[in-house]
């Protein structure tokens, strides 16, 4: 059962390789348990970046070694991806699943193009 998911078209990572964006979904029902997955699409390959299942009103809990962190507020999820490098530039897709109570709903956003520019190395300074 399809659900509308919105996310920004483009985001630029900061100099520390961190990018943040909001994933918003139009919930058809009153979900209490939600699963959010970030997928990366590059060269027609789709890979899972991170995933978290959370109870409405609670914090998102990603795995300890995850490069993602996030917070939720109503039907919005604020996602942050850390440790990005230029080679990680690509389309990051937000997938939202309403897990409980039934019925199950799933929606996939159009993706956020994240651009990552590796910082220039600092030139040696002469004293």
């Amino acid at each position: 059962k399809a659900m509308h998911v919105a996310q920004p078209a483009v985001v630029l990572a900061n100099s520390r390789g961190t990018a943040s964006f909001v994933c918003e979904y139009a919930s058809p029902g009153k979900a209490t348990e939600v699963r959010v997955t970030v997928l990366r699409q590059a060269d027609s390959q789709v890979t899972e970046v991170c995933a978290a299942t959370y109870m409405m009103g609670n914090e998102l809990t990603f795995l300890d070694d995850s490069i993602c962190t996030g917070t939720s507020s109503g039907n919005q999820v604020n996602l942050t991806i850390q440790g990005l490098r230029a080679m990680d530039t690509g389309l990051y897709i937000c997938k939202v699943e309403l897990m409980y109570p039934p019925p199950y709903y799933m929606g996939i956003g159009n993706g956020t193009q994240i651009y990552v520019i590796d910082p220039e190395p600092c030139p040696d300074s002469d004293f």
């Epitope: 058809p28 109570p101 039934p102 019925p103």
Partner: antibody, heavy 114, light 112 residues
């Protein structure tokens, strides 16, 4: 194609026990809430019990609370219903359903009689 | 006594439009949860007819439609046909019961 195949029904005496199983295929079983719905002869549909994808949330109809236990094994794509202290009024066809009764099995008949 | 109230029976002649109501409460339909409708032909397992208040699964004719307002919902069948003779049930999630509730069912008879 989604398939739900119930088994384990049969004739049992009042006070006896049965364990129903539902083998699921054709969809990502571990994503979905699953439930058991029953229909007594000539009667309407009655939700019996349900379980969330992770087994964290379980619910039971008042008529079976304390006697029936629902469980699932996501690695085996199987749903279970352990029925204890069976009564004559538990006689029904028991259906396994996925999500909010999106798909239904063909049902298994449970008859409680002496 | 079902948590959702449906008329026990309904009837119509071929070609007619028939409506079946389903009345709930603030803990189910009124809480914003989606209503679903099922058709059970004699001697068979129930089949999903309408999901999410007004959506038809593929294969269900557009003669069947659903709607929801407040604490009630309804199923409409237009252009009634003899093969529509069946039992019809509504269902919805209920917060207070932490489970699914069904209506008592409506037996639809196609006359003539």
């Amino acid at each position: 194609e989604v398939q739900l195949l119930e088994s384990g029904g049969g004739l049992v005496q009042p006070g006896g026990s049965l364990r129903l199983s539902c083998a699921a295929s054709g969809f990502t079983f571990s994503d979905y809430y699953m439930s058991w719905v029953r229909q007594a002869p000539g009667k309407g549909l009655e939700w019996v019990s349900g379980i969330s994808w992770s087994s964290r949330d379980k619910g039971y109809a008042d008529s079976v609370k304390g006697r029936f236990t629902i469980s699932r094994d996501n690695s085996k794509n199987t749903l279970y219903l352990q029925m204890n202290s069976l009564r004559a009024e538990d006689t029904a066809v028991y259906y396994c359903t996925t999500d909010l009764a999106r798909y239904w099995g063909q049902g298994t008949l449970v008859t409680v009689s002496s | 006594q079902s948590v959702l109230t449906q008329p026990p029976s309904a009837s119509g002649t071929p070609g007619q439009r028939v409506t079946i109501s389903c009345t709930g409460s603030s803990s189910n339909i009124g809480a914003g949860y989606d209503v679903h409708w099922y058709q059970q032909l004699p001697g068979t397992a129930p089949k999903l007819l309408i999901y999410g208040n007004d959506n038809r699964p593929s294969g269900v004719p557009d003669r069947f439609s659903g709607s929801k307002s407040g604490t009630s919902a309804s199923l409409a069948i237009s252009g009634l046909r003899s093969e529509d003779e069946a039992d019809y049930y509504c269902a919805v999630w209920d917060d207070s019961l932490n489970g699914v509730v069904f209506g008592g069912g409506t037996k639809l008879t196609v006359l003539g």
